[in-house]
């Protein structure tokens, strides 16, 4: 099952994915695609890395804002719309026999909340779900691969979100 990430319409979505180049600087191809990872490559490719280049970007809204030369291949989707919702595949194409890593990440885009700011509660929310709801331009400072993320379901997130909204908090997820 996919780990779920939430972003508001108009904000930036951050989908984490990383690997450790071994040895350092020895980069492997990575593809990002819309749709669950198939047996090979990525379907509906949104971008891919080859050596030190980013190629096949299908939209100017797709970016690798981390240091992908060091293995941070997390995807940022700028100015998300409801149509961006869905499963994304991050495939780290490590050479060899059945070595490539595939990660399915589910992006849920929600309509923005019309509520007043409450920074303290916002901080509480992002510390409670630091890798699911993120406010920074680059998402969480600590990059992890999806397989190591905490198991938090969407119902829990929405429940907490609704509770905080009821108390006047701003839920701004980027």
């Amino acid at each position: 099952s996919e780990v779920e990430y939430i972003a508001e319409v108009g904000q930036n979505a951050y989908l984490p994915c990383s690997y450790t180049p071994a040895p350092p600087g020895n980069l492997v191809p990575v593809c990002w695609g819309k749709g669950a990872c198939p047996v090979f490559d990525c379907s509906n490719v949104v971008l891919r890395t080859e050596n030190r280049d980013v190629n096949d970007r299908t939209s100017g809204r797709y970016w690798l804002k981390g240091d992908f030369h060091k293995g941070d291949v997390s995807l940022t989707i700028e100015n998300v719309t409801l149509a961006d919702s869905g499963v994304y595949c991050c495939r780290i194409q490590i050479p060899g026999i059945m070595n490539d890593e595939k990660h399915n990440l589910k992006l849920v885009v929600i309509k923005p909340a019309k509520v007043t700011p409450a920074p303290t509660l916002q901080r509480d929310l992002t510390s409670a779900f630091p890798r699911m709801l993120t406010t920074g331009e680059h998402g969480p400072a600590e990059t992890q691969t999806p397989g190591s993320l905490p198991d938090v379901n969407l119902t829990q997130i929405f429940t907490l979100t609704n509770e905080l909204r009821d108390s006047g908090a701003t839920i701004r997820t980027a």
């Epitope: 749709g35 198939p38 090979f40 490559d41 379907s43 490719v45 096949d56 194409q93 070595n99």
Partner: antibody, heavy 123, light 108 residues
Amino acid sequence: QVQLVGSGGGLVKPGGSLRLSCAASGFTFSDYYMSWIRQAPGKGLEWVSFISGSGSIIYYADSVKGRFTISRDNAKNSLDLQMNSLRAEDTAVYYCARDGMVRGMNFYGMDVWGQGTTVTVSS
Amino acid sequence: EIVLTQSPGTLSLSPGERATLSCRASQSVSSSYLAWYQQKPGQAPRLLIYGASSRATGIPDRFSGSGSGTDFTLTISRLEPEDFAVYYCQQYGSSPITFGQGTRLEIK
């Protein structure tokens, strides 16, 4: 025209080795993943192995892992399958097939097939 | 591994009739990764449908595919004499790539 031609089949004793080849023409070979599929007499299709366009990514079916080796030479537009430690159950027609493109945008299907080459493993 | 089960095993119909072939997966397969093939005796398989519903190049429009999740269908709207063959479904959703056991379409 787009074509795949397989060769190298034959009769071999159990425990023996055989090398199958597939010559590609009519398309940019290095752009495509390639697969080997086999079909035992009177049976259905069984996927054996695939290799990425660059040759860096390889997958095998459990039934052949450790015994078969897939490789390609993009300069020669050729695909090979080295088969070692052959068993009676490896007896089949072996097909090479062109898979989805490396830069495919949603195409998963084997759209070009070789004519098949027969491998018989028997004492 | 994803097991694909095709039914019926054999389908006996006459030219001009409609054929409906089923492929059921043991676990969900994205529709993008489901293909159908036709194989005639002594020949290599021929790709008919990819992405569950897209016809491959040169395939007549009497062939159509549908379905999602675990249930997929190949329909031949009006059988021609050359359509009698064995049909296989195949999934690319997870390794290993797997095929169904085949449905034999024979002349009644």
